[in-house]
């Protein structure tokens, strides 16, 4: 552990109420194949406990979805991963829209610091699938 | 090697017969940029030889494809990556549908154990491209 | 650094002139969350300085884009990542088309050698977004 191999893979717990775009995550072997080794969850949001460069990855699949359902909504459904606290470090790290698709998946390298809390904001009226092979979110510490 | 840096990147060899949705993979420097360093192939399926948390990634591009060809099929074309043997550990790890797109790509962290065989099941009537820059599948050991 | 943890995450600087399909990248803390630790930029193209197997990842979002704008162009918009020099090692590593989507994102493991220069070619008439959370390109050394 002293090598700093902090790592987490989370599954969706629930969405927030209408005015809260955040997805709420959960992790742990009792829940399936999700886990937290280093990072921790704070009210369903992922908090970093070790400084470093991380690979952040996410896949979100919409629960009720056809090519038409994503395109016919006035407000496009968009997923953004960002640092939401501390406020001084707030920034969007990764953003994707669902256009005519029903799944987004991406990954990126980014520096994160101890105490950074990552939020995953899903805007739009469509809700995500909670199937653990369709919607997941994870981070992996890769170097100091 | 004692660090456990097991890693593999595979290219598509062929698809199975009609009632076998599995993709069959191949790897090795003689074939191009694919390789197996630790994991092994068993009849075209990837078998894990070291316990740990792995980053699993895949990209599959459909061979004869336009936005209409993926959307007009009654049965949507879907790609699922899972542990298919041993049967006691059988589970879907990663699943994506092609909706109106012609390529899916994703990745996730997951615990895998020695002897786990990963299968990549492509359901639907469309066939994958064998171009090595369009269709590939890989795993990377990241920590114990 | 002797461990060989070469890593880079780049943001889009600009596109080339009409007959140059390459995207030109930039990186460094002064620019935001991009960085180069080992690899270097040569006229906006990423050059590898250490042999090894790398995880290459990319996300590109088109700037003015709707599902119709990507589908109505005669020549589909395509993104290819490859080794463009030295010429003897020129090869396409990763290729995706935008079909009816506005973002592509993928990743793969590939062996790279010191001196390899990676090019990211965007063909078509649509331009990429320069938002740093929508378009980025990175590599991570993962093992010798």
């Amino acid at each position: 552990e002293s090598l700093g191999w902090d790592i987490a893979e989370l599954q969706l717990n629930h969405t927030g109420p209408q005015q809260d775009p955040r997805l709420y995550w959960q992790g742990g072997p009792a829940l399936g194949r999700s886990f937290l080794r280093g990072p921790e969850l704070d009210k369903g949001q992922l908090r970093i406990r070790r400084d470093g460069i991380y690979m952040v990855h996410i896949q979100v699949t919409l629960a009720i979805c056809s090519s038409t359902s994503t395109s016919r909504h006035h407000h496009p459904t968009t997923l953004a991963v960002g640092i939401c606290s501390p406020a001084s470090r707030s920034i969007s790290l990764l953003r994707l829209s669902f256009h005519q698709g029903c799944t987004i998946a991406s990954q990126r390298l980014t520096p994160l610091a101890r105490g950074d809390t990552l939020c995953t904001n899903l805007t739009g009226t469509l809700l995500p699938s909670r199937n653990t092979d369709e919607t997941f979110f994870g981070v992996q510490w890769v170097r100091p | 090697e004692s660090l456990g840096w097991d890693i593999a990147e595979l290219q598509l060899n062929h698809t199975g017969p009609q009632q076998d949705p599995r993709l069959y993979w191949q790897g090795g420097p003689a074939l191009g940029r694919s390789f197996l360093r630790g994991p092994e192939l068993d009849k075209g399926q990837l078998r894990i030889r070291r316990d740990g948390i792995y980053m699993v990634h895949i990209q599959v591009t459909l061979a004869i494809c336009s936005s209409t060809s993926t959307s007009r099929h009654h049965h949507p074309t879907t790609l699922a990556v899972g542990i298919c043997s041993p049967a006691s550990r059988s589970i879907s790890l990663l699943r994506l549908s092609f909706h109106q797109g012609c390529t899916i790509a994703s990745q996730r962290l997951t615990p895998l154990a020695r002897g786990d065989t990963l299968c990549t099941n492509l359901t639907g009537t469309l066939l994958p491209s064998r171009n090595t820059d369009e269709t590939f599948f890989g795993v990377q050991w990241v920590r114990p | 650094e002797s461990l060989g943890w070469d890593i880079a995450e780049l943001q889009l600087n600009h596109t080339g002139p009409q007959q140059d399909p390459r995207l030109y990248w930039q990186g460094g803390p002064a620019l935001g969350r991009s960085f180069l630790r080992g690899p270097e930029l040569d006229k906006g193209q990423l050059r590898i300085r250490r042999d090894g197997i790398y995880m290459v990842h990319i996300q590109v979002t088109l700037a003015i884009c709707s599902s119709t704008s990507t589908s109505r162009h005669h020549h589909p918009t395509t993104l290819a990542v490859g080794i463009c020099s030295p010429a003897s090692r020129s090869i396409s590593l990763l290729r995706l088309s935008f079909h009816q989507g506005c973002t592509i994102a993928s990743q793969r493991l590939t062996p790279l050698a010191r001196g390899d220069t990676l090019c990211t070619n965007l063909t078509g008439t649509l331009l990429p977004s320069r938002n740093t959370d929508e378009t980025f390109f990175g590599v991570q050394w993962v093992r010798p």
Epitope: G16, Q18, A63, S69, T125, L127, R130 | - | -
Partner: antibody, heavy 119, light 107 residues
């Protein structure tokens, strides 16, 4: 504790207008959207739409556009439903409802306001 | 819009009986299914959300199950205070839609 208290019953003539209020207490009003649900006599529940209490943006379900208007007085922690050009078929109990932690799951309801439209 | 078809529309049972109500969605709603109880002249009250999660303070005799398009609400042992109308509601996308209700009476 969290409460949604609605205005009293209304008897209106066809063509008139009515404004139903829903006063919230026990929480920060602008943190949660307010939904409106209609129940005609002896009938089921019909979701009418909702209003974002932070931005004021309303969303109306099909069939509830035009004559139906959602509005707010954030200083009074109150949401309003106004119905104009009333018709006999608007006779119903109107409820305001609010979520807690989960999207589209209504933990809190007003007691309901009966609007009767009759000549 | 997603249609929710609830059955039966009414049922009569005795105290202590096991009571089952079903709700069918016109398409897969991915377990985003909630159940409410409404007594005459009162507002609906949340009982179960996300198919099977019991809302705080709701007695354990109430339960829910199902997946895809088919969902079930069960009262394991009917009590006199359970006399009410029960509604299912899909919560996967707008517009939100409810079943037409099941009126439960005591024999």
């Amino acid at each position: 504790q969290i409460q949604l208290v609605q205005s009293g019953s209304e008897l209106k003539k066809p063509g008139a207008s009515v404004k139903v209020s829903c006063k919230a207490s026990g929480y920060t009003f602008t943190n949660y959207g307010m939904n409106w649900v209609r129940q005609a006599p002896g009938q089921g529940l019909e979701w009418m739409g909702w209003i974002n209490t932070y931005t004021g943006e309303p969303t109306y379900a099909d069939g509830f556009t035009g004559r139906f208007v959602f509005s707010l007085d954030t200083s009074a922690s109150t949401a309003y439903l106004q119905i104009s050009s009333l018709k006999a078929e608007d006779t119903a109990v109107y409820f305001c409802a609010r979520e807690e932690d989960y999207r589209y799951v209504f933990n809190y309801w007003g007691q309901g306001t009966l609007v009767t439209v009759s000549s | 819009d997603i249609q929710m078809t609830q059955s039966p529309s009414s049922l009569s049972a005795s105290v202590g009986d096991r009571v089952t109500i079903t709700c069918q969605a016109s398409q897969d709603i991915s377990n985003y299914l909630n159940w409410y109880q409404q007594k005459p002249g009162k507002a609906p009250k949340l009982l179960i959300y996300d198919t099977s999660r019991l809302h705080a303070g709701v007695p354990s005799r109430f339960s829910g199950s199902g997946s895809g398009t088919d969902y079930t609400f069960t009262i394991s042992s009917l009590q006199p205070e359970d006399i009410a109308t029960y509604f299912c509601q899909q919560g996967v996308t707008l517009p939100l839609t409810f079943g037409q209700g099941t009126k439960l009476e005591i024999k």
